[in-house]
Structures are given as C-alpha cells and as structure tokens.
C-alpha cells in the first residue's frame, strides 16, 4: 500500500507533494534571516529568535508550538577582562600577546555582541611555563611523546592543533598528561585548502580566524549541574566542584598568525615524523620550551571566563498524527550559534524551517501524517548538547515508550561534493530507497539519481554498488536520543571530498567568518545542495511518519553486527597468548549474532506476509521494529559513562565525534598490553563480551514471534 492510504487522503498528498513544496529560494531567504546577528546561547538575541521561530511555525500550520526553557550552566568570556596568551621574558614583561578578537568580516564591522574566541567552560587561571607541542593531542600523540620520546608534559603548557578529534578529548588527554594549560590553534595544513583564497574571497581560514567551541567531557550528561534530570525550576544543582565534565586547566584557542609566533621559537626535540608537521614556516619542534636565544622566555595564559547558570529555550512544534498520535517522529536541529552561524547551525535551521513550512502547507490542505511529527529548535547545542538533552531528560518516559525515530538537522553542508549519511542500520534501506527517488544536484549527474552520484563519489568500502553510510558518533543533538534512549536516529548533510580535502571539518567552522555570504558566494549559490538535504531529511521524516509499516529493515542490523563482531575479535586476536591464558572466548557473541541473523530473517518474512489491514497486528509488528533499537540499551550504561547506554554504538572514548562499535569490549581491549594488572584487564574484556552477547541475544528475542 502507498503511504497516502494511511490517512485516507487524496493521492496528491503523498511524498511527492511534500517534496515538490520544498523550495531552494525559501531556504536561502530563511538562512539570510537567521544569520544577520549572533545568536549565542543564553543571550536575548537567541531568545528573540526562538520566539520568532515559534510564531512562524504556528503560521506555517503546526498544531502547537511551545517554548521549553531550562536553566543550565553556560560559559562566557569576561567582557572587561579579556582572555589572551603572552610570551613573557625573564623579568615577567609581556613581549608578545595574542589577539583579543577576530577582525570582522566586510559588512559586519558594526555588529555588536560578537563573542571573542574562547574555549567554553575553561576554568580561570594564569599559568605560565614552558611550551610543549603535542600535535593533535590525540591519545596516540601523547603515547608518542611520553613513551617513545620520553617527554614529560607535567607542569607544562601544551599547544595542540585543532582537527582529527573533538577538542574536549584533546583537553582531557592534556590533563591526564599533567599539563597546566592548553593552547588550541588552527594549522593551515588542516584549515587552509590549497588553491582556495581565504575569506572574504574564498572559504579558507584567514590568519586571524579562530575556532570557538566547548571543551567539556560530558559523556552524554547534558547540563553539568543536573546529570540525568532536567534543569527545571525545582532542580537540585551540584556544586561546581562536582559538576560533570568540566576541564580543570585553562584552555584558549588562537589563529595561525598568533600560533606562528609561539611555535617559531620552539626548541627541544625535533618532530618525531612528518605527520607532526603542519604548514606553518616553523620547525614544529616539540620542546619543552623555546630554543637557545629565547630559552628564558615563557608562555603565560590569562583566562578570566566565567561559568553561569543561564536560561535557554527550545522551540517544540507538534503536528499531530491522524492514526498513531502516540508515536513520535522527531526532526531536530539547534538554533544557537557561536557567532553568525552561516553554516553551523543556520544552514540546518533554514532547512528545518522549510520542511515545517511544507508539512504545514499539506496540513492546511487537509492532510495529516499517520504518526505525530515533533519539530525541535534546540538551544545551547554548542555548550554541550544541553537543550536537546534537558528536553529528552524531561520527556524520557514518553520518548522511550513512543519515540519511533529522530532525524538530526544541524549544518546542511560542510562541503558541496556529495551526500554524507550517518544512521542506525535500521534506516539503511530507507535512505537507499529515498535517494534513488531524488534527483542528484551534482554537476555531471544531470538526470541521474542522488543515489547514483552519492554511490559514485562515496562508495561503500564493503558493498559494491552501494554508498558509504557511517556509524553515529556524537557531537550533535541526536546523542541523547540514540546513545541514551535507544531511539533509531540518523543525520544527513552535503560534504566535501575527503580524498582531496584532508582538512578537518570546514575551514571557517565556529569562526566569525561563518556568514551568510560564505554560503551564498562559495558553497551553494543556487542553494541546490541545501534543497537536496531538505529533501533527504524531510523525505526520511515523511516516510517514518507516514508509512504504514515502519521503514526499518532489521536484517541490516544483522549484517553490521557480524561485521562488528569480526572486527572486535580481530583486535583481541592481536593478543593470542593472553586470550589463551585467560580463556577469552567470543563464542557467545558470535552465537548471539547468528541467532539475531536468523530471527531477523524470519521476522522480515513475516513482515512481508502479515495482514496489514489488522490494526492490532500492524501495531504489534511496528512496535517490534520501533523497540528493536531500544533493545540494545543497557540500563547500567557503559563503564564510567552511564549516559552512553547503547551496547552496539557509543562515541569513541578517544574522539567524541567518531562512533565506536562494541564500545565496551573495544575500551576494555584498548592499550591492554600496558595495564598493570593483566588478569583484571582481561577479566573486564570477558565481562564486556558477556554483556554484548547477552544484549544481542536479548534484542534478537524481541523480534521473535510473540507467542
């Protein structure tokens, strides 16, 4: 049956009608409207934008649109006492200071309330000491420094280049290494693509451009003062000393002009290999400290930012379902930005706005979706996914019982090369089928499907003729829905060519230069990529909310579970002797995966044959599909990460942005050869195999015939 039969509506109200209503020109107009002033979380400007969106969503035709507010911990620079870094001579005189703000882009010289670059949630402090260059400050970089080069970071200020991993992991690694301060900088090797001009003449980062960002290690906790519970009017708040995830050492970001001045004087050890060299004209010496002539000079940080409990506002819009109003499909993306938010988040918010408008147009013509669609404009994502997490904490009981799917809608673009999708395996077939029906916006693929251009440009490493779909990690608002609550989730955006552009993210990420003009002039002048992303995100929401049978294929989960089991087994098999000594076996996991595969296959057969006109059976089958993702949740969570509860996927412990499969086993095996008590360490591996095997088996049983 076609999805339009669900609500007895005229055939014109189908997916095509919804997609045809989406217009590139509207997305462009909305992006312009959302990017003229900064919308920093916790500010009056962002509250006003929340009210504007509430009003417009009501006009578009949603049934209700409410503001949901929370009082959460945010972080701001001190307006009268700016943050900076200096080089001081032996007398303590400051002979060099880093800049206090980015030079404004043309046309924005008179805009007020541009927050200067800072590392959100950095503690205050004025540490001084010798500098150590730590490359990307990844786990492996500190291993190289400490184990191979015998360089001790204790009591040193470390300087790390942005890129490769989430900045919060860099700071955590530096803290664990004993550093007393962290300087983060953008190296042109990572943020300046060859052959492209710097802003305002291209999309590259100028020397004075700086990436803002939070440096928390929340591990899914949300507001640092109210982990697990909403930061509402009667909340009990932890003291700042007990807050979750706050860094303990001062941190500050700088651009490459200022980094040049710090790095050019570095002495000590030479870089261990070419992977430690960026593109600045400096030796990339590791240190510690400056070279001969400058050896008496030190680096001093001056950080005066403050943490403040501040009110934030989510906008929650509801389009009630006609048949299953107690089943929720959620489309959410954040509204708060570091400055203008030209890409992050407003290229996503503009797309959500147009999707809401299109759904509203259909609703005004008498249509309703089968299931309820919730639309969310999240606040304080940049400060640790706070708005989405607090709302999910407040509504967790409803969500765990009624949540069908969550589609994330942050930045629509990070390039203009091809589609990028990260999602639960349950959505693979939905994404494949949808993209086969959409036109590719890519040059050279006129008249071809999006699936075709995507597959050509980003082929799956495992399956020929299919596109790459990645694991969900974190660093965005789907985190609480997927990693904590076990609601099937996905995200889509247009991306760069990772083969030729090895820089991290996009060069102007979280800088003042992320403007409307950046998008309109350089990334997507026709807004055709934005429109395609709107079609993908909107199309997914439409199908999830309107198809009679949920568009989830449990067999795809079986395939990836086998792949992940093979991968983790091969990691463990790097230690064959220990596996033998400690009787480590993966038999239970492989057996559970085999059972899952067989049961999923049988379930899929039943799904083809059952009587879809019987509402009880239909609901029963759909519930089994809806609750499958939920079945991978371990109520006890992962070790030391209670809010990461998904047993199959979690954000990597070494990079929040990346997804790790069988994370419990992976972390237990990580660097196991260095553990002081191997018996205990391998015991934990065995326990994690047990948890994973049990969870996979238990999930399989939810797909069995109910009686």
């Amino acid at each position: 049956k076609s999805s339009n039969e669900a609500t007895n509506i005229t055939p014109k109200h189908n997916m095509k009608a919804f997609l045809d209503e989406l217009k590139a020109e509207n997305i462009k107009k909305f992006l312009y409207n959302f990017t003229q002033i900064p919308h920093l979380a916790g500010t009056e400007q962002n509250f006003q934008l929340a009210k504007q969106i509430q009003s417009q969503w009501k006009e578009f035709g949603l049934d209700s649109v409410e503001l949901a507010h929370y009082d959460v911990l945010l972080s701001y620079p001190n307006k009268t006492h700016p943050n900076y870094i200096s080089i001081i001579n032996e007398d303590g005189n400051e002979i060099f200071n880093t800049s206090l703000f980015e030079p404004p882009p043309p046309g924005y010289e008179n805009v007020s309330d541009i927050v200067p670059p800072f590392s959100a949630f950095s503690p205050q402090g004025m540490p001084e000491g010798d500098l150590v260059y730590v490359n990307y400050a990844r786990t492996e970089d500190f291993f190289k420094l400490e184990r191979d080069m015998k360089i001790n970071c204790s009591g040193k200020i470390v300087i790390a280049r942005y890129g490769k991993v989430f900045r919060g992991n860099k700071v955590k690694n530096a803290q664990l290494a004993g550093a007393k301060g962290v300087i983060l900088y953008s190296d042109p090797a990572d943020y300046f693509a060859p052959g492209v001009k710097s802003y305002p003449d291209g999309w590259n980062l100028p020397g004075g451009g700086v990436q803002r960002g939070n440096i928390l290690n929340l591990n899914g906790a949300g507001d640092p003062l109210t982990p697990g519970y909403p930061a509402n009017e009667y909340a009990y708040r932890r003291g700042i000393a007990e807050a979750v995830g706050l860094p303990s050492i001062p941190v500050h970001p700088i651009g490459y002009y200022d980094a040049q001045k710090l790095l050019e004087k570095m002495g000590g050890s030479a870089p261990p290999d070419s992977s430690w060299r960026g593109s600045l004209k400096v030796p990339y010496n590791v240190g510690p400290g400056f070279t001969g002539n400058f050896s008496t000079q030190k680096v001093k940080m001056h950080i005066h930012s403050t943490n403040e409990v501040t009110r934030i506002y989510n906008v929650i819009g509801t389009l009630r379902g006609a048949v299953e109003p107690d089943r929720y499909v959620i489309l959410g993306g954040h509204r708060d930005s570091w400055v203008f938010g030209g890409i992050d988040p407003q290229s996503g918010a503009a797309v959500v706005h147009e999707i809401v408008r299109s759904f509203g147009t259909l609703k005004k013509e008498g249509w309703r979706p089968r299931r309820t669609i919730l639309f969310a404009s999240w606040d304080a994502e940049e400060f640790g996914l706070l708005g989405s997490t607090e709302w999910a904490e407040e509504n967790s009981r409803l969500l765990q019982e009624r949540g069908v799917a969550y589609i994330n809608a942050d930045s629509s673009i990070e390039g203009n090369y091809t589609l990028r999708v990260d999602c639960t395996p349950l959505m693979y077939s939905l994404v494949h089928n949808l993209t086969k029906e959409l036109k590719s916006p890519d040059e050279g693929f006129e008249g071809k499907s999006l699936y075709e251009s995507w597959t050509k440009k980003s082929p799956s490493p495992e399956f020929s003729g299919m596109p790459r779909i990645s694991k969900l990690g974190s660093g965005n608002d789907f985190e609480v829905f997927f990693q904590r609550l076990g609601i099937a989730s996905g995200r889509a955006r247009y991306t760069k060519n990772w083969e030729t552009n090895k820089f991290s993210g996009y060069p102007l990420y979280h800088s003042v230069y992320e403007t409307y003009e950046l998008v309109e002039k350089f990334y997507d002048p026709m807004f055709k990529y934005h429109l395609t992303v709107a079609q993908v995100r909107g199309g997914m929401v439409f199908e999830l909310a309107n198809s009679i049978v949920l568009p989830f294929d449990c067999r795809d989960y079986a395939v990836v579970l086998r792949k992940y089991a093979d991968k983790i087994y091969s990691i463990s098999m790097k230690h064959p002797q220990e596996m033998k000594t400690y009787s480590v076996s993966f038999d239970s996991l492989f057996s559970a995966v085999k059972n899952f595969t067989e049961i999923a296959s049988k379930f899929s057969e039943r799904l083809q044959d059952f009587d879809k006109s019987n509402p009880i059976v239909l609901r029963m089958m759909n519930d089994q599909l809806m609750f499958l993702e939920r079945a991978f949740i371990d109520p006890l969570g992962l070790p030391d990460r209670p809010f990461y509860r998904h047993v199959i996927y979690a954000p990597s412990s070494h990079n929040k942005y990346a997804g790790e499969s069988f994370p419990g086993i992976y972390d237990a095996l990580f660097d196991i050869e260095s553990k002081v008590d191997p018996s205990k360490a391998w015991g934990e591996v065995k326990r994690q195999i047990y948890v994973a095997a049990f969870t996979v088996q238990a999930a399989a049983e939810t797909l069995s015939e109910v009686a």
Partner: antibody, heavy 119, light 107 residues
Framework: EVKLVESEGGLVQPGSSMKLSCTAS????????MAWVRQVPERGLEWVAN????????YYLDSLKSRFIISRDNAKNILYLQMSSLKSEDTATYYC????????????WGQGTSVTVSS | DIQMTQTTSSLSASLGDRVTISCRAS??????LNWYQQKPDGTVKLLIY???SLHSGVPSRFSGSGSGTDYSLTISNLEQEDIATYFC?????????FGGGTKLEIK
C-alpha cells in the same frame, strides 16, 4: 623583483576626470589584492581603495565611493583608478600598492605619481 | 572610522640609539597593525606587519610590539639610512587608516 610603476599624473581641471594606471611585474598579479593610497603634500597617508584578486570585490574610502572606481586587468597586470568630478582636495601623490589578502599589509609600493587638481 | 594617533610627530636621536615610536588606535585593532617607512624621496616600504612580524629584507634591528590599542615600533641601533618618516596603519577594519607619521631625524 616586485615592481609597481604608476602612470604619469599631471595637472587637471576641477570637475574633470583622470585615470591612473599601475603596471605590475615580478609576481603573479592575480594572486594579490591591490590598493591605491594617496598623500597630500606634507601630510599623512590616506587609503583610497582596494580590490580583491579577480576584481569581484572593491572597497573604498566612503567619501570617495561615488567618484572613484578601482579596477584591474589581470591579463595585462594593470591596476586602474578612475577618478571623476575631481576636486582641489584630491591633489596628492597617488601610490599603487600590493596586499596579501583582505586584512594584510601593503607589502610593496610604487614610487607614486603626482596629481594636481587646479584651475 | 578607527583613528590612528602617533603622538610624536618628530623625533631626534643619535646614531646607535634605541628609538621607540608609538601608535595608538581609537579602538582595539586585534594586532592588525603595520608599520611603513617613507624616505625623504617619497619611497614607501613595509617594515612590520601584524604588530611584530618582520617583512622580508627588513633589518632585524626593527621590531614591533603591542596589542589592543597600543603599539610600538623599535629601532634597536639607529643607522643613518633609518632617517625617514614612519607611519602606522590598522588593517582590522575598513576604512584602512594611517597614523599621522613620526619623522625621525639625527641629532
């Protein structure tokens, strides 16, 4: 060697027009911003205008925006300044200069050309 | 517009002296401060860019420092060829503006 050579200036009547040019050599012209800066005799320097790499963006001193036009011909390695409705206060030495990008310093300057606006 | 002020319009010093020329901006220019030398014949050269970076070919006796609104150019060991007028210029925002200049003379 970077070289910037301005065209001859000269004496012009108030209200008339004049076009200055600057011929560049010794570097890839299209890789640089270019600018005009002027200096009234015995006075300081005053930035007039600059232009980006391909001429798609131009920036002017507000008070000159309606009368002066900066342009470039990357094929010929020439920078231009079209001045119209000239006034006596436009009398100055006009320098052509090279810049790196929008915020960068002007790292090489021409020798300057003298323009006198007088009846 | 950002006003650039060089309070000392002329300065006399002896050869070998350490000379410091200062420049103040009417608002924070985030270190986008450049120094130029204009010789008596009108020739203009860039000395220092982004507060403290030495332009290629400029002798190391020239150095720059500062941040926020206050900047300075130092000549550590004055030579005859340094006799010129020195201008500061902000590159932080449009319009680009210059200081009034400091004329350096030999005592």
């Amino acid at each position: 060697e970077v070289k910037l050579v301005e065209s001859e200036g000269g004496l012009v009547q108030p209200g008339s027009s004049m076009k200055l040019s600057c011929t560049a050599s010794g570097f890839t012209f299209s890789d640089y911003y270019m600018a005009w800066v002027r200096q009234v005799p015995e006075r300081g320097l005053e930035w007039v205008a600059n232009i980006n790499y391909d001429g798609s963006s131009t920036y002017y001193l507000d008070s000159l925006k309606s009368r002066f036009i900066i342009s470039r011909d990357n094929a010929k390695n020439i920078l231009y300044l079209q001045m119209s409705s000239l006034k006596s206060e436009d009398t100055a030495t006009y320098y052509c200069a090279r810049g790196g990008d929008y915020w960068d310093a002007m790292d090489y300057w021409g020798q300057g050309t003298s323009v006198t606006v007088s009846s | 517009d950002i006003q650039m002020t060089q309070t000392t319009s002329s300065l006399s010093a002896s050869l070998g002296d350490r000379v410091t020329i200062s420049c103040r901006a009417s608002q924070d220019i985030s270190k986008y401060l450049n120094w130029y030398q204009q010789k008596p014949d009108g020739t203009v050269k860039l000395l220092i860019y982004y507060t403290s970076s030495l332009h290629s070919g400029v002798p190391s006796r020239f150095s720059g420092s500062g941040s926020g609104t206050d900047y300075s150019l130092t000549i550590s060991n004055l030579e005859q060829e340094d006799i010129a007028t020195y201008f500061c210029q902000q590159g932080n925002r449009l319009p680009r503006t210059f200081g009034g200049g400091t004329k350096l003379e030999i005592k």
